[in-house]
């Protein structure tokens, strides 16, 4: 048999092989498609299925506009004029070109060392539904899953049956200073069918910034607690990507896994004392916080004139 | 919203020719196979003729064939039925009808047009 | 010339009552049968397309299946407005054929 493929909404003729060009014909096409159960022998008289299949007088069949539901096989037997059957086989592929395809959403820069999201890669209205691929620099991405990670998507018109594809791409770039250049492109997997290319995107990479600086929350606010309280430190840095942050109290290390909370429950007078953080990021060394003081205190010096400081070390008039 | 307005029934004798119309508006007309259907007076459906939608190919019944011609003026959104060499037996309501083919089998109809065959 | 052998011709039934009409084919149509509701000095109202789908704006009371050649409508609980005379038609082959009607009138 033979393989076809037709664009969608196309023509298509298929030519029964050793049929008379012109009548008198000893022929029959029969057809295996979307449009039916089993084979469907066309009538030559022609009939209702003339308006997707259509016996030509010279024996070949029409297709006037090829859709999705005309995937399948066609064959015609024929009686040549010396008496001999010829039978020729059809294998009826259909395709749909997409428009051309878009980055959606793109960065307007990236981090190194950092997931960076890329931009979305959009086609609209492929048959079959085909591939999207990443390119950087011109180099085609393969997915690693740490590195450079894809998400994809695939949906199908409900009427149309088409499909669109989406690809998000997440890279985690090694070192800033560069300008690579992203495109997408989507290929349908026919022979001799070129992709179709999105316009490149050019992106800068720069080195994780500096903490702007580093701050030092505490709850409750001023560090007076009443014993038995809880006490919140908060280190809070505005850095890309968040630093481990170690603890310093009094001028020494607290033995503590690297956390950017540090919570004192129960707070006793042992707990009292000058609390520091100090953030470390990869690429900028140690960053030390200002210094906060907790004091616990029975009824807390600037705590009210009568009446006690409550767990919550706010004060409750008697 | 798709409508289709039959005209030009009426009485005529046996032998007589009539030109029957049909209106179509409301869908893309050239996009359409179109038929005729006949209903006899206390009696059952029974199809006339089919075109296709460029009007180059059109189909018949045997009980017809050779005496009614379908044709379409696609820039008038128009359907039309020539019937000669009338019987008393093509006494019937005309209903004209949009499809025909395999993708829309019949969906939509007229109310119709009664044409009486009678001496 | 295929043939659609449309039954019962015609049926008496009550207000909510479930009501089955069938037609066989003479020969396989695939799945190329319309159903049409005819109420009197009026034109048929396609019902179902296709064999099984309901068509536009019709209540979901009506269904229609297939079996082979067999082809079937249901009202799965008739009411007033639905006494009338049903037909169905295959569209696979010329001479499109109708079946020969069945009327459902109240009992």
């Known amino acids: 048999g033979q393989n076809i493929t037709a664009r969608i909404g196309e023509p298509l003729v298929l030519s029964c092989k050793g049929a008379p060009k012109k009548p008198p014909q000893q022929l029959e096409w029969k057809l295996n498609t979307g449009r039916t159960e089993a084979w469907k022998v066309l009538s030559p008289q022609g009939g209702p299925w003339d308006s997707v299949a259509r016996i030509l007088p010279n024996g070949s069949l029409l297709l006037p506009a090829t859709g999705i539901v005309d995937e399948g096989t066609f064959r015609c037997r024929a009686t040549n004029r010396r008496g001999k059957e010829v039978k020729s086989n059809y294998r009826v592929r259909v395709y749909q070109i997409p428009g051309k395809p878009e980055i959606v959403d793109p960065a307007s820069e990236l981090t190194a060392s950092v997931p960076n999201k890329v931009g979305t890669c959009v086609s609209e209205g492929s048959y079959p539904a085909g591939t999207l691929s990443w390119h950087l620099d011109g180099k085609l991405l393969i997915p690693d899953g740490k590195e450079t990670l894809v998400k994809e998507e695939t949906r199908r018109h409900p009427e149309t049956g088409l499909f669109t594809l989406r690809s998000e791409l997440t890279v985690i770039p090694t070192q800033g200073g560069t300008h690579p250049t992203f495109s997408c492109s989507f290929s349908l997997g026919l022979p001799r069918r070129r992709p179709l290319n999105t316009a490149p995107i050019q992106l800068r990479v720069r080195e994780p910034g500096p903490p702007e600086g580093i701050q030092l929350l505490v709850e409750p606010e001023g560090g007076i607690v009443a014993p038995g309280g809880t006490v919140t430190l908060t280190c809070a840095i505005s850095a890309q990507p968040p630093p481990q942050v170690h603890w310093i109290k009094d001028g020494a290390p607290l033995p503590l896994a690297p956390s950017p909370v540090l919570l004192l429950p129960e707070v006793g007078h042992e707990d009292e004392g000058t609390y520091s953080c100090v953030a470390t990021h990869p690429s900028h060394g140690p960053q030390e916080s200002p210094p906060v003081s907790i004091r616990v205190t029975e009824t807390g010096d600037e705590g009210p004139a009568e009446g006690s400081v409550g767990e919550s070390g706010l004060g409750t008039l008697a | 919203e798709v409508q289709l307005v039959e005209s030009g029934g009426g009485l005529v004798q046996p032998g007589g020719s009539l030109r029957l119309s049909c209106a179509a508006s409301?869908?893309?007309?050239?996009?359409?196979?179109m038929t005729w259907v006949r209903q006899a007076p206390g009696k059952g459906l029974e199809w006339v003729a089919s075109i296709d939608n460029s009007g180059d190919n059109t189909y018949y019944p045997d009980s017809v064939k050779d005496r009614f011609t379908i044709s379409r003026d696609n820039a008038k959104n128009s359907l039309y039925l020539q019937m000669n060499s009338l019987r008393a037996e093509d006494t019937a309501v005309y209903y004209c009808a949009r499809g025909g083919d395999i993708t829309t089998g019949l969906d939509y109809w007229g109310q119709g047009t009664l044409v009486t065959v009678s001496s | 010339d295929i043939q659609m052998t449309q039954s019962p011709s015609s049926l008496s039934a009550s207000v909510g009552d479930r009501v089955t009409i069938t037609c066989r084919a003479s020969q396989d149509v695939g799945f190329y049968v319309n159903w049409f509701q005819q109420k009197p000095g009026k034109a048929p109202r396609r019902l179902i397309y296709?064999?099984?789908n309901l068509a536009d704006g019709v209540p979901s009371r009506f269904s229609g299946s297939r079996s082979g050649t067999d082809f079937t409508l249901t009202i799965s609980s008739l009411q007033p407005e639905d006494f009338a005379t049903y037909y169905c038609?295959?569209?696979?082959?010329?001479?499109?054929?109708f079946g020969g009607g069945t009327k459902v009138e109240i009992k």
């Open positions: 409301g869908f893309t007309f050239n996009n359409y196979w």
């Open positions: 038609l295959e569209f696979d082959e010329h001479p499109l054929t």
């Open positions: 296709r064999a099984t």
